[in-house]
């Protein structure tokens, strides 16, 4: 079963810009990636980017750029005003959902200030059985 990882990286020189990196370890066919956050602006989950292997990427503010970093990992860059960034991000959790075959959906989340290595145990949101 694939393991999903998430890391959030603040830019050292620009406190209003940071990146969410996430990927899947192991052998699986990725059909869709959704990057979202919780606790930012309101209590609900905010979709930041959707990345499709063939049809490209789509992102929503405050996401500035979303792209594939490798065949099994993505990166989303976010930009916002510095004062807003400091106040909003303290309680924000970033989540990445990888829809893979044949393992189904795998989600991992982490917050901006967590200091562990960044490997999160995958939580199956949906299990699809292979034929």
């Amino acid at each position: 079963s694939p393991e999903v990882w998430v890391q959030v990286q603040m830019e050292a020189t620009n406190l209003s810009s940071f990146s969410v990196h996430c990927g899947v370890l192991g052998y699986s066919l990725i059909s869709l990636v959704t990057v979202s956050c919780e606790g930012f602006v309101d209590a609900g989950r905010t979709k930041l980017a959707v990345l499709h292997p063939e049809f490209g990427t789509q992102q929503w503010a405050p996401a500035r750029q979303a792209h594939w970093e490798t065949p099994n990992s993505v990166s989303v860059t976010l930009t916002m005003g510095q004062s807003k960034a400091r106040s909003s991000l303290a309680n924000t959790t970033f989540c990445c959902e990888f829809v893979t075959f044949p393992h189904g959906s795998r989600v991992a989340c982490r917050d901006l200030h967590r200091s562990d290595p960044g490997l999160s145990a995958p939580t199956p949101a949906l299990n699809l059985q292979a034929d």
Partner: antibody, heavy 123, light 106 residues
Amino acid sequence: QVQLVQSGAEVKKPGSSVKVSCKASGGTFGNYAISWVRQAPGQGLEWMGGIIPIPGIANYAQKFQGRVTITADESTSTAYMELSSLRSEDTAVYYCARDTGRGYTRHFWFDPWGQGTLVTVSS
Amino acid sequence: DIQMTQSPSSLSASVGDRVTITCRASQSISSYLNWYQQKPGKAPKLLIYAASSLQSGVPSRFSGSGSGTDFTLTISSLQPEDFATYYCQQSDILYTFGGGTKVEIK
């Protein structure tokens, strides 16, 4: 124009480890993954694994899982591949290569490549 | 793992010949297929990416086609510098290379 320069040839004893370096120059290092590929004498190419220097997460081919460790030092723009428990079958040229892609789709390829490092395992 | 099978494993041809190398994937890989050329003692060189896109600086006599499981590399008119070994590579699930095709002088 990015260039990848690898460390020199190594001769190792069976059971030992080897660590090969790959230094990038002439471009951004952190945002591009570096893969390691090996080629035994007279044989084909074999992908071992790769790493995204930022955030430093590596992915490995199942065959090498547990025996290979790929790391990267962003401050020196250098990637490393360490292979442990060496045996004679590990005698090969080891290449590093940059995973290059369009970004907006999942298409990736290897370009450029390092010059290769010959690792000889012999008692 | 996805297996990549190249054929033929070797071929003999003359300058000016049209050469075709095929690569078959053990499962559908869409167009996640690259082609490389390697000469003895040298690192591989990218020729074609995403099944049919010609890498910058590569002569137009090289072309790639195919999708799904079957792919082809064609050299329209073989030149002396084209005698080398050619590898296909899938990038759909991690990376796997084909076994290689050695193009030799007839």
